[in-house]
């Protein structure tokens, strides 16, 4: 069964191509209510009435998933838990189409990076998606940020069109994904 969320698309617009955020400085673990204040509005089909969507308000729909671009800063682990609070997971990129969609969204925020659901325990162990599935570098390459001072960047974020490894403790924004079934 598919949950249908009804929302007024009039408020689900982008301003100057940037995601709106009323809570950019909330660095603490968000509550359910504060999460709703710290996410980007949906880039929805522009209709004046009420539309039916398989996604909750403020989530963006693309193909068979809903996406939420969170504008609260958190570690990778904190971001993962924030997505869980909303019944979702950190982004898992399954296809080049999906990657293109995500790049288009985050490229409108060139100053920001977004955690995705890829991590590893340490450099000797392969990258793993949050759901336990294997990572294939056929889809994208992960550009390393490792230095002698920071030798263990074991989480992954996307910045504009490039995907980097990064220290998991660095506060960043994040992308939650909720798959739906018709």
């Amino acid at each position: 069964t598919m949950a249908i969320w009804r929302s007024n698309s009039g408020s689900n617009t982008l301003e100057n191509g940037y995601f709106l955020s009323r809570n950019k400085e909330n660095h603490s673990q968000p509550t359910q209510s504060s999460l709703e204040d710290s996410v980007t509005p949906t880039k929805a089909v522009k209709t004046t009435g009420v539309l039916s969507s398989p996604c909750p308000p403020n989530w963006i729909i693309y193909e068979k998933s809903c996406y939420l671009f969170s504008m609260s800063l958190n570690s990778w682990d904190g971001s993962k838990r924030q997505c869980w609070q909303l019944g979702s997971n950190l982004l898992k990129i399954d296809s080049s189409n999906e990657l293109g969609f995500i790049v288009k969204q985050v490229s409108s925020q060139p100053d920001n990076s977004f955690w995705i659901g890829l991590s590893r325990p340490q450099t000797e162990v392969p990258w793993l998606w949050e759901d336990g599935s294997t990572f294939s570098s056929n889809l994208f390459q992960i550009r390393t940020t490792a230095t002698q001072e920071n030798p263990s960047p074991n989480c992954v974020w996307i910045h504009v069109s490039v995907i980097y490894d990064q220290l998991c403790s660095v506060p960043s924004y994040s992308i939650c994904e909720k798959k739906f079934s018709m």
């Epitope: 325990p121 340490q122 000797e124 162990v125 949050e130 759901d131 336990g132 599935s133 294997t134 294939s136």
Partner: antibody, heavy 118, light 107 residues
């Protein structure tokens, strides 16, 4: 639903080889590592290694290096674990398990008892 | 290899009891730890992954905590079906290793 079904019990002589199969269903076989874990009678769990069903890449515990071979046949969603030069202390239940979050083992086969006896 | 130790090795308890099992890694493993329950003649069952995340379908009376080298599995109110052996497993480095197990039996 996710299911892993293993081949039946085997009795082998010391020095022989055994090949255990693990047929997966209910998910995309190539998306998740398959691990092999064994348990000797009355003992704890011992990780033997894994195979990436997509690439065929393997990672074996040092203890089994040179004696174990993990393979897969993606056309029938089946993973295999072959252990050679069997000894009596290889007598154990051999499990396949599908990888889950944080490299945990979320789904397990029913186990295959391999008895090594002369 | 990372050695995993568990304590106690066995514990006798009654239905309704709160039971705590500890697991210690010989070196830091961050949160890359899982807990399993195994009953005689059965395959292990995943309870907790990532040190504290409850596997889908597992009752909420099970909880995990800890990070680094010291971890805990807690059963808040033991039920008859919880009498079993519990194992921890580290997934921080190869080879992945398990603790020796803790047997929870009826007092």
């Amino acid at each position: 639903q996710v299911q892993l079904v293993q081949s039946g019990a085997e009795v082998k002589k010391p020095g022989a080889s055994v090949k255990v199969s693990c047929k997966a269903s209910g998910y995309t076989f190539t998306d998740y590592y398959i691990h092999w874990v064994r348990q000797a009678p009355g003992q704890g769990l011992e990780w033997m290694g894994w195979i990436n069903p997509n690439s065929g890449d393997t990672n074996y515990a040092q203890k089994f290096q040179g004696r174990v071979t993990m393979t897969r046949d993606t056309s029938i969603s089946t993973a295999y674990m072959e252990l050679s030069r069997l000894r009596s202390d290889d007598t154990a239940v051999y499990y396949c398990a599908r990888n889950s979050g944080s490299y945990s083992f979320g789904y397990w086969g029913q186990g295959t008892l391999v008895t090594v006896s002369s | 290899d990372i050695q995993m130790t568990q304590s106690p090795s066995s514990v006798s308890a009654s239905v309704g009891d709160r039971v705590t099992i500890t697991c210690r890694a010989s070196q830091g493993i961050s949160s890359w730890l899982a807990w399993y329950q195994q009953k005689p003649g059965k395959a292990p069952k995943l309870l907790i992954f990532g040190a504290s995340s409850l596997q889908s379908g597992v009752p909420s009376r099970f909880s995990g905590s800890g990070s680094g080298t010291d971890f805990t599995l807690t059963v808040s109110s033991l039920q008859p079906e919880d009498f079993a052996t519990y194992y921890c497993q580290q997934a921080y480095s190869f080879p992945f290793t398990f603790g020796p197990g803790t047997k929870v039996d009826i007092e």
